[in-house]
């Protein structure tokens, strides 16, 4: 069971300081951006991180959403990352959900975050280069200290 608590506005970056944004095709991508670019591309660069209480505490349970014309929420259904047009729900009556991730700081690096899927244990949000695009994907952690699954989360206010 997950119950919504509060929401924050955040900018999410990978460890190469590329900014996560949702493109016109609703794809989550990373791109080099100055602070000015980041502001100019808002609200596509501003993510609503909603925190949830968890009946089985396993870290901070969160959803990641973005509001352009409508609110879309990040999902890892079938291990494929996509944004689905939906509000983060108040309650989820299950111990796993495709839209719930456990946000945890990297041991020894309090400012670096990882997001583990609640549906697929051991699978994390990651940045992966595909041709000339840097995509947000779901990836099984295969090596300790994998930088591709680490992010910084900066609160908007």
């Amino acid at each position: 069971y997950f119950g919504k608590l509060e929401s924050k506005l955040s900018v999410i970056r990978n460890l190469n300081d590329q900014v996560l944004f949702i493109d016109q095709g609703n794809r989550p991508l990373f791109e080099d951006m100055t602070d000015s670019d980041c502001r100019d591309n808002a609200p596509r660069t501003i993510f609503i991180i909603s925190m949830y209480k968890d009946s089985q505490p396993r870290g901070m349970a969160v959803t990641i959403s973005v509001k352009c014309e409508k609110i879309s929420t990040l999902s890892c259904e079938n291990k494929i990352i996509s944004f689905k047009e939906m509000n983060p729900p108040d309650n989820i009556k299950d111990t796993k959900s495709d839209i719930i991730f456990f946000q945890r700081s990297v041991p020894g690096h309090d400012n670096k975050m990882q997001f583990e899927s609640s549906s697929y244990e051991g699978y994390f949000l990651a940045c992966e280069k595909e041709r000339d695009l840097f995509k947000l994907i779901l990836k099984k952690e295969d090596e300790l200290g994998d930088r591709s699954i680490m992010f910084t989360v900066q609160n908007e206010d």
Epitope: E6, S7, L9, P43, I48, K67, E69, N87
Partner: antibody, heavy 118, light 107 residues
């Protein structure tokens, strides 16, 4: 910086129509919902409706569906509200206001004072 | 549409007092509630969004809390410049709605 510029006042005759304007600057006009809010003297705030300039999708409060029509001109980054069949009940301050990233309305115009009088 | 019932309508307080305003939604609005301050002759200003987040530049004496149907806005230590009308607002669903307002007057 973000600015929403509205004319200070409009005086119109009962039964006529008026088109109020709101010129936006300092941000990507097509990326945020624009809202219109009515405030009668000494009264509270009433939400009229909103428009998403990127797609021109609109929502209205039922009370204002036959009174207000929201439009935009993306080339000039201007939002408009047409108010029709005006009566003294329509005399009020009308604000345009922009959505924050997810919650609230963080930028407001100075408001246009509409006076309906013969 | 969702009705936001705001109480009290008026508050007469002294500088330094603690003030609490409540808003009750007619159905759950999650945490999609904002609070605004409107000073005489001015446009409203956003103070709190997502029920509890202080907007940039807002002094920390202003706080908000609540979830679902019951929301609270508090000014921990009222100052003379806080003379204004305060409104709650739900942006959970369309049509968006405002509370009736609370007029804060300083003795």
């Amino acid at each position: 910086q973000v600015q929403l510029q509205q004319p200070g006042s409009e005086l119109v005759r009962p039964g006529a129509s008026v088109k109020l304007s709101c010129k936006a600057s300092g941000y990507t006009f097509t990326s945020y919902w624009m809202h219109w809010v009515k405030q009668r003297p000494g009264q509270g705030l009433e939400w009229i409706g909103n428009i998403y300039p990127g797609t021109v999708n609109t929502n209205y409060d039922e009370k204002f569906k036959n009174k207000a029509t929201l439009t935009v001109d993306t080339s000039s980054s201007t939002a408009y509200m047409l108010l029709s069949s005006l009566t003294s009940e329509d005399s009020a301050v009308y604000y345009c206001t922009r959505d924050y990233y997810g919650g609230g309305l963080n930028y407001w115009g100075q408001g246009t004072t509409l006076t309906v009088s013969s | 549409s969702i009705v936001m019932t705001q109480t009290p309508k008026f508050l007469l307080v002294s500088a330094g007092d603690r003030v609490t305003i409540t808003c009750k939604a007619s159905q759950s609005v999650s945490n999609d509630v904002a609070w605004f301050q409107q000073k005489p002759g001015q446009s409203p200003k956003l103070l709190i969004y997502y029920a509890s987040n202080r907007y940039a530049g807002v002094p920390d004496r202003f706080t908000g809390s609540g979830f679902g149907t019951d929301f609270t806005f508090t000014i921990s230590t009222v100052q003379a410049e806080d003379l204004a009308v305060y409104f709650c607002h739900q942006d959970y669903s369309s049509p968006r709605t405002f509370g009736g307002g609370t007029k804060l007057e300083i003795k």
